[in-house]
Interface confidence: low
C-alpha cells in the first residue's frame, strides 16, 4: 500500500493582521495511526503551534472534528494574526509509539506572511520658516507595515514631486517595516494655501492609500514690500503720510514710524485685508504737523514682520514747499494707485 | 472587468501557439489568472493557471497539456500569456481566459484557479489542422 | 474527478438542485448557455454570487457534495452547469457538465 504522505497545499498564505490565518494540511491515509502536530519552523529549536494529541492552544482551532475516524483534514485556523506570527509552518504526522509517539512525516511547510497595515503618514516641516525661492525639507514616516513593498509619492497641491529620498527599514527580513522619506521643496510666493501631501500605497490598503499633509503656511514667510506715500490734507499746516505693507505672511507685523529717526508710533497689524493668495496687506497712516518742523522732515516707515530684521522705506518731507503742491506732486509719482486716500 | 484574449486561429500540428489575455479593471497582480479550453461539443477543460501572492508566482497545468505549456504573466502590462507546443489536433476549441476571485484581500491567497473563477473572457477558438 | 448528473428537468417555477461531489474543499459553478460561448459564474468558493447574479442562484457544500440550487427556475435558465473544484495539486478539474431543460 502506498506510504502516507502529509500534504500541505499552499506554498504561501498572506493573511492581513488581526484576521484569522488559515493552515491546510491534509495526509493520504489513515495509517499508521498517530496525532498530528503543528510546529512554526524547523529542527530542535520549532516552536509547537497544536498538538492534536494534549495541550491548550486558545489561538487555534480545526478546520474539521479530528475526533472523526476517518478525518485526514489537519488544517488549522490561527486567529488574531499579528507579524510576530509570520514565519513557515510545518505539518507532522506521528506515528503511535512506546513510550513516546515518533515523528513520521512532515508536510513541506507554508509559508505565513502577516500583512499588517501601514500607519498613517506623518509630515513634518522644517523648525523655522523660509522665504520664497528657498528650498525646504518635509519629512514622512510610516510605520509598522508588512510586506516590506511599498510605494510612497509627494504632490504639492497635486502635482507630483520628483526630488526626495525614501528609505525602508530594517534593510533584511523583519516582522514589520518602516519607511522615512525627505522631499525637497522649492517655496514660492503664492504657496500661503499650498499643501504637501505624503501618500503611501500598500497591499493592505487595497487601494487607497494613506496621506499625510502639511500646510505651507506653516512653513512659508512671504516679506512685506513698502511704500510710502504722502497726501494732502484740508489743514494748510498739516500732510497725510500713508505706508502701505503688502502681500506679506504670516500677519505677526509691527510697524514703527520714524520722524528723522525719533519713534513717533509704534502699532501692531490688526485690521488686515487678506489677498486671494493668502497673503495680508496692511496700511498705517501719519498726520504730520508741518509748522513744527523748520527744516525739512524724513519719515520711515520701518517694519518687523515675524521676527525679521525691520526692514524701512522712507519718505523726505519738505516744508518749505506748500502741502497741497507737495501732495499733487506725490499723487503724480503714484498715478494708478489703488489705494483709498485716508484724512 | 474585462479580459480580452487574443492569438487564435488555424494552427498546424506540431506547431506553436501564443495566447494572450490583456486584463482590465482590477488589480491584477492580486489576482490568479487561469486558461480553460472547450473542444467542439465538448465540456469545460482546465489548461493552465498562474497564481500570485506575496510577489510569487506559480502554475499548474491540466494533464492534457502538462509538458507542452507554459503560462506566465507581465503584471506591468496586466497580461497572461499561454504558449502551447506540439500541438495536436485535440488542442483545438475555444481557449477563455479566466480570473479567480483569490487574491491578496483580508483573505488568504488561495491558489486556486477552476473552484473561483469569478469572471471570463469571450474566448479565442483556436482551430489545429493540416 | 468530479461527478455531477448529466442532465436534470424542472417545471417553470420550481426549485431545482445540482450535485457535483469530490474530494474538494471549495467548487465553482459556471453556466453556459451556448456551446463555445463564454461561461457565466454563479457561484465561487462554494457559496459566494458575484453581486449580478440573481439571488435565485445559491451554492452549498455539505461533506464532499456541493449543490447548486436555482429557486423558481425560469425558462432562460435553459443551459448547461459546470462545477469546478481543484486537485491536491492544484490542477483545475470540472464536471463534464449537467443539461436543465425547463418544462
Known amino acids: 500500500e502506498e506510504e502516507l504522505q502529509v500534504i500541505q497545499p499552499d506554498k504561501s498564505v498572506l493573511v492581513a493582521a488581526g484576521e484569522t490565518a488559515t493552515l491546510r494540511c491534509t495526509a493520504t491515509s489513515l495509517i499508521p495511526v498517530g496525532p498530528i502536530q503543528w510546529f512554526r519552523g524547523a529542527g530542535p529549536g520549532r516552536e509547537l503551534i497544536y498538538n492534536q494529541k494534549e495541550g491548550h492552544f486558545p489561538r487555534v482551532t480545526t478546520v474539521s472534528d479530528l475526533t472523526k475516524r476517518n478525518n485526514m483534514d489537519f488544517s488549522i485556523r490561527i486567529g488574531n494574526i499579528t507579524p510576530a506570527d509570520a514565519g513557515t509552518y510545518y505539518c507532522v504526522k506521528f506515528r503511535k509509539g512506546s513510550p513516546d509517539d515518533v515523528e513520521f512525516k512532515s508536510g513541506a511547510g507554508t509559508e505565513l506572511s502577516v500583512r499588517a497595515k501601514p500607519s498613517a503618514p506623518v509630515v513634518s516641516g522644517p523648525a523655522a520658516r523660509a522665504t520664497p525661492q528657498h528650498t525646504v525639507s518635509f519629512t514622512c514616516e510610516s510605520h509598522g507595515f508588512s510586506p516590506r513593498d511599498i510605494t510612497l509619492k509627494w504632490f504639492k497641491n497635486g502635482n507630483e514631486l520628483s526630488d526626495f529620498q525614501t528609505n525602508v527599514d530594517p534593510v533584511g527580513e523583519s516582522v514589520s517595516y518602516s519607511i522615512h522619506s525627505t522631499a525637497k521643496v522649492v517655496l514660492t510666493r503664492e504657496d500661503v494655501h499650498s499643501q504637501v501631501i505624503c501618500e503611501v500605497a500598500h497591499v493592505t490598503l487595497q487601494g487607497d492609500p494613506l496621506r499625510g499633509t502639511a500646510n505651507l503656511s506653516e512653513t512659508i514667510r512671504v516679506p512685506p514690500t513698502l511704500e510710502v506715500t504722502q497726501q494732502p490734507v484740508r489743514a494748510e499746516n498739516q500732510v497725510n503720510v500713508t505706508c502701505q505693507v503688502r502681500k506679506f505672511y504670516p500677519q505677526r507685523l509691527q510697524l514703527t514710524w520714524l520722524e528723522n529717526g525719533n519713534v513717533s508710533r509704534t502699532e501692531t497689524a490688526s485690521t488686515v485685508t487678506e489677498n486671494k493668495d493668502g497673503t495680508y496687506n496692511w496700511m498705517s497712516w501719519l498726520l504730520v504737523n508741518v509748522s513744527a518742523h523748520r527744516d525739512d522732515v524724513k519719515l520711515t516707515c520701518q517694519v518687523e514682520h515675524d521676527g525679521q530684521p525691520a526692514v524701512s522705506k522712507s519718505h523726505d518731507l519738505k516744508v518749505s514747499a506748500h502741502p497741497k503742491e507737495q501732495g499733487s506732486n506725490t499723487a503724480a509719482e503714484n498715478t494708478g494707485s489703488n489705494e483709498r486716500n485716508i484724512y | 472587468v474585462t479580459l480580452d484574449e487574443s492569438g487564435g486561429g488555424l494552427q498546424t500540428p506540431g506547431g506553436a501557439l501564443s495566447l494572450v489575455c490583456k486584463a482590465s479593471?482590477?488589480?491584477?497582480?492580486?489576482?490568479?489568472m487561469g486558461w480553460v479550453r472547450q473542444a467542439p461539443g465538448k465540456g469545460l477543460e482546465f489548461v493552465a493557471g498562474?497564481?500570485?501572492?506575496?510577489?510569487?508566482?506559480?502554475?499548474t497545468y491540466g494533464a492534457a497539456v502538462n509538458g507542452r505549456a507554459t503560462i506566465s504573466r507581465d503584471n506591468g502590462q496586466s497580461t497572461v500569456r499561454l504558449q502551447l507546443n506540439n500541438l495536436r489536433a485535440e488542442d483545438t476549441g475555444i481557449y477563455f481566459c479566466?480570473?479567480?476571485?483569490?487574491?491578496?484581500?483580508?483573505?488568504?491567497?488561495?491558489?486556486?484557479?477552476?473552484?473561483?473563477?469569478?469572471?471570463w473572457g469571450h474566448g479565442t477558438e483556436v482551430i489545429v489542422s493540416s | 474527478a468530479v461527478t455531477q448528473p448529466a442532465s436534470v428537468s424542472a417545471n417553470l417555477g420550481e426549485t431545482v438542485k445540482i450535485t457535483c461531489s469530490g474530494d474538494?474543499?471549495?467548487y465553482g459553478w459556471y453556466q453556459q448557455k451556448a456551446p463555445g460561448s463564454a461561461p457565466v459564474t454563479l457561484i465561487?468558493?462554494?457559496?459566494k454570487r458575484p453581486s449580478n447574479i440573481p439571488s435565485r442562484f445559491s451554492g452549498s457544500k455539505s461533506g464532499s457534495t456541493a449543490t447548486l440550487t436555482i429557486t423558481g427556475v425560469q425558462a432562460d435558465d435553459e443551459a448547461v452547469y459546470y462545477c469546478?473544484?481543484?486537485?491536491?495539486?492544484?490542477?483545475?478539474?470540472f464536471g463534464a457538465g449537467t443539461t436543465l431543460t425547463v418544462l
Open positions: 479566466a480570473k479567480a476571485a483569490g487574491g491578496c484581500t483580508a483573505h488568504n491567497c488561495d491558489a486556486y484557479i477552476a473552484d473561483s473563477i469569478d469572471a
Open positions: 479593471g482590477f488589480t491584477f497582480n492580486s489576482y490568479n
Open positions: 498562474i497564481y500570485s501572492a506575496g510577489g510569487d508566482t506559480s502554475t
Open positions: 474538494s474543499s471549495y
Open positions: 465561487y468558493d462554494n457559496d
Open positions: 469546478g473544484n481543484e486537485d491536491m495539486n492544484y490542477v483545475g478539474i
